[in-house]
Interface confidence: medium
């Protein structure tokens, strides 16, 4: 049924879904704080632009009686129930900031006539790609795939002189929500990653992973996995690893590697960590003071969601355009806006672009060092350390297939 939007006459409301099932275990209070901080900034920006309007947020809480697994597994119906609650209360804002779980976002998008924009902190899966009124403010799986293919093909860097075309992917089903969808995308036989690789096998058991580390008959030297360093250590422990094995550890939402007091443990020496470049001002800001390094990105996405709405509201109001139109709902893409800690760019499909950073462990200093960066917006790799102090022979990444010569 058509729900009227509280979105006119100088009063603009944001509906924020506060779901019990979430991509990250951020206390809802922290998300509320992030939203409220965002509102303060938006009000200031609109005022500075001479726009005398009211912007508020309504937090819609789920009753939590049925959908209480906490993680995303029971989120599908929770999102729809919250939408029903909004519908019954006839209380829909100009924009919906909400579901972070891929399941719930996909289902909500499917089951509703969306004439309003949806902004998500999460929804990492490929099933949420290319949705016309959905904006995602945390790197989705598609962006990871494009980096990996780009990096695999690269063969003209001082430290990577071979193109790769093979990989193992470790996926045991206990991953965090972001990792679950990242690895799902790599596993999918129809995905870009699978299409571009000549050989890819998914390892599902600890023993399979452990055996590959020293197997002379392995089909690839490269293993992709996703999670924190401890996830790798549980698998690998202090086992010997063949000298030409390269483990790519995808750990995008973890700022720890950039902190001054971090020394890389020995077991990380064969590992390249793929993470996101941390925001300039974020590490010491009041906003992030009470958040752990793995959580800043999630709460920040909520905050930036508010700022994005403010940005679009300002543009439409300045142009004298109506907010409750399909044009507004479809406008949250192909743009750059001023985020909390710097400019945020959204691609043609409303997905956030970012700088991914590939780190290695310096054998000299035992510190994580930046090997290269990758701009998801232009799909381009930029080398940073031209002579890395690698553990690998000749300070070069090995070929992906043992015994195969230069290509």
């Amino acid at each position: 049924s058509q729900v009227s939007q509280n979105c006119h006459n100088g009063s603009y409301e944001i509906s924020v879904l506060m779901m019990g099932n979430s991509a990250f275990a951020e206390p809802l209070k922290n998300l509320e704080d992030a939203v409220n901080e965002g509102l303060e900034i938006v009000r200031g920006r609109l005022q500075n632009a001479g726009l005398n309007v009211t912007v508020n947020a309504t937090f819609m809480y789920s009753d939590g009686l049925i959908h209480n697994s906490g993680d995303c597994r029971s989120s599908t119906c929770e999102g729809l129930d919250l939408l029903r609650k909004i519908s019954n209360a006839q209380r829909m804002g100009c924009v919906l900031i909400g579901p972070s779980c891929t399941y719930s976002t996909f289902q909500m998008y499917l089951d509703t006539e969306l004439s309003y924009p949806m902004i998500s902190a999460g929804s990492f899966g490929l099933s949420c790609d290319y949705k016309e009124t959905l904006t995602r403010l945390m790197s989705p799986a598609r962006k990871l795939m494009y980096f990996l293919v780009n990096f695999w093909k690269t063969n003209d860097l001082p430290f990577k002189t071979y193109s790769w075309s093979t990989s193992y992917v470790y996926k045991n089903g206990t991953e965090t929500e972001d990792c679950f969808w990242y690895l799902n995308a790599l596993e999918a036989s129809v995905s870009y990653f699978s299409h571009e690789l000549g050989f890819k096998v998914v390892l599902r058991q600890d023993k399979e992973f452990q055996d590959i580390l020293m197997d002379h008959n392995r089909k690839s030297n490269v293993i992709i996995m996703c999670g924190g360093p401890e996830f790798l250590y549980k698998l690998k422990g202090d086992r010997a690893v063949a000298e030409d094995i390269v483990i790519i550890l995808v750990d995008l939402f973890n700022d720890q590697y950039f902190e001054d007091n971090v020394t890389a443990p020995d077991y990380m020496k064969n590992v390249l960590v793929l993470t996101l470049s941390p925001g300039n001002s974020l590490l010491n800001s009041s906003f992030s003071r009470n958040l752990s390094p793995t959580k800043r990105d999630f709460a920040l996405a909520y905050l930036n969601g508010i700022l994005l709405f403010g940005h679009m509201l300002k543009i439409f109001l300045e142009n004298g355009e109506n907010i409750t139109t399909p044009k507004f709902a479809h406008a949250f893409r192909n743009l750059t806006f001023e985020g909390y800690d710097g400019p945020v760019t959204l691609d043609d499909w409303g997905d956030v672009d970012s700088t991914m950073v590939l780190l290695y462990t310096s054998v000299d200093t035992k510190k994580y060092k930046v090997l290269l960066t990758y701009d998801t917006h232009v799909n381009k790799t930029y080398p940073v350390d031209m002579s890395p102090t690698f553990t690998w022979k000749n300070s070069k990444l090995p070929n992906d297939i043992t015994g195969r010569g230069p290509q």
Epitope: E26, T176, G228, E230, K234, T263, P265, Y267
Partner: nanobody, 127 residues
Framework: QVHLVESGGGSVQSGGSLRLSCATS????????MGWFRQAPGKARERVAS???????TYADSVKGRFTISRDNAEKTLYLQMNSLKPEDTGTYYC?????????????????????WGQGTQVTVSS
């Protein structure tokens, strides 16, 4: 199952130092995070310091610059070096561990984030 056993507590004068140890049945490297908490008589248990998987450390404001958390993987031990001790540091100190990030990537900032606890070791600082 992770077993934690604290030691190193005792009585000390204000301004003195102590080093607490926590022997673990599993390698510290295999933990998503580990931490030290303390409980003064009649008060709630509070986090003192924690160390996350990659090695980053966080401290309660009241102990910053005085306490240092560290881990030794070979010895399977977590440490808390306490310098410039004050009478308000008195209490029972507990070692805590969380093996898995979980589907949710626990933040390791509250009691609820830690699943395994030691029995505690008493620290008394007199003026």
């Amino acid at each position: 199952q992770v077993h934690l056993v604290e030691s190193g507590g005792g009585s000390v004068q204000s301004g003195g130092s102590l080093r607490l140890s926590c022997a673990t049945s599993a390698s510290p490297y295999s933990m998503h995070c580990m931490g030290w908490f303390r409980q003064a008589p009649g008060k709630a248990r509070e986090r003192v310091a924690s160390i996350l998987n990659a090695g980053s450390t966080t401290y309660a404001d009241s102990v910053k610059g005085r306490f240092t958390i560290s881990r030794d993987n070979a010895e399977k031990t977590l440490y808390l070096q306490m310098n410039s001790l004050k009478p308000e540091d008195t209490g029972t100190y507990y070692c805590a561990a969380r093996p898995d990030a979980g589907r949710w990537r626990s933040a390791c900032t509250t009691e609820l984030d830690f699943g395994y606890w030691g029995q505690g070791t008493q620290v008394t600082v007199s003026s």
